[in-house]
Amino acid sequence: LLVSQGVLLKCQKGSCSNATQYEDTGDLKVNNGTRRNISNKDLCASRSADQTVLCQSEWLKYQGKCYWFSNEMKSWSDSYVYCLERKSHLLIIHDQLEMAFIQKNLRQLNYVWIGLNFTSLKMTWTWVDGSPIDSKIFFIKGPAKENSCAAIKESKIFSETCSSVFKWICQY
């Protein structure tokens, strides 16, 4: 089962049934390079291996991972610590379907911290697991310098001052 913004999606044999109408968001690249909306069917179709993972209460499960969306606001470093204290980490985005899932669950239009910051030592955007960002996939708008941390808003990733306070997403 997928819980998406309070809507329970049932994935059965690669198809989706959904008790409530849901507006699709997010972009998916298909083979010919054109954009189309990612549908609930797309999200469900990739969930076949999702059945064994158990998530704690108030965490959402998707693609074998668990996600928690904060309601309060903290700086990037405080958000980072908060996730660590709960044996998780700030969100690392792996693919377009995961980003679409995140977008579907972001109810507010404001910035939300993710696990990405600019390290002046490496001079690159780096995920909290230490891996560098793949610039062939990800585009971040805004300053790329010390004290720059990444936040998502709608379908975009922005560079913001790390001391700014936003909501955040934990993942394990």
């Epitope: 972009d27 377009q96 585009f139 300053p143 922005f158």
Partner: antibody, heavy 114, light 113 residues
Framework: SLEESGGRLVTPGTPLTLTCTVS????????MIWVRQAPGEGLEYIGI?????SAYYASWAKGRFTISRTSTTVDLKITSPTTEDTATYFC??????????????WGQGTLVTV | DVVMTQTPSSASEPVGGTVTIKCQAS??????LAWYQQKPGQPPKLLIY???TLESGVSSRFKGSGSGTEFTLTISDLECADAATYYC???????????????FGGGTEVVVK
């Protein structure tokens, strides 16, 4: 300010590098685009140098152009010019402080004739 | 890449008149659209960004509207100095880098009689 340079008369196939020299701001704060305009024609977007040093191109421009940068310059290399590349080449700066891209500072352009 | 289609290619109106220029995107670009004015021998000058936000120092006679795929630039109370070519530009992007392309419309030449 922005100033393009390097435009000249070149023979087809001879690589040419154009330079956009910036002053008064940092390239780690502001993205930069290259745009060209053939004589009597409209504006044509080539690509962008993002604040983190990553370059992205229009589909038609991939392989034909390379964008790179130093601390104060953004270069556009025309890898193998053809007569169709004859144009004035502009660089422009994104204001950087907005969710929208705002290309509000432009150079005067440099003319390339192939 | 998104394709921007601009109409008309030229327009002629008297001083004091109004010109309306339309720009259509081949797919939704939200409100990520800019309008420019260009005069011969000069670089483009930004007029409007975010589809409707007037750039600092630009006359309020210039008005941008629209979102998604349909956009309009309206120039009212035309002055001789408004004679120029006007371009729209998609400034849409997303976290997915291949969406980061900023094409222009074909341009509209405005003649003020």
């Amino acid at each position: 300010s922005l100033e393009e340079s390097g435009g000249r008369l070149v023979t087809p196939g001879t690589p040419l590098t154009l330079t956009c020299t910036v002053s008064g701001f940092s390239l780690s704060n502001n993205g930069m685009i290259w745009v060209r305009q053939a004589p009597g024609e409209g504006l044509e977007y080539i690509g962008i140098m993002n604040t983190d040093g990553s370059a992205y191109y229009a589909s038609w421009a991939k392989g034909r152009f390379t964008i790179s940068r130093t601390s104060t310059t953004v270069d556009l290399k025309i890898t193998s010019p053809t007569t169709e590349d004859t144009a004035t080449y502009f660089c422009a700066r994104d204001a950087g402080s907005n969710e929208h891209f705002v290309f509000n500072l432009w150079g005067q352009g440099t003319l390339v004739t192939v | 890449d998104v394709v921007m289609t601009q109409t008309p290619s030229s327009a002629s109106e008297p001083v004091g008149g109004t010109v309306t220029i339309k720009c259509q995107a081949s797919e939704s670009i939200s409100s990520d659209l800019a309008w420019y004015q260009q005069k011969p021998g000069q670089p483009p000058k930004l007029l409007i960004y975010g589809a409707s936000t007037l750039e600092s120092g630009v006359s309020s006679r210039f008005k941008g509207s629209g979102s998604g795929t349909e956009f309009t630039l309206t120039i009212s109370d035309l002055e001789c100095a408004d004679a120029a070519t006007y371009y729209c530009q998609s400034t849409y992007y997303s976290w997915y880098s291949s969406n980061c392309v900023f094409p222009f419309g074909g341009g509209t030449e405005v003649v003020v009689k």
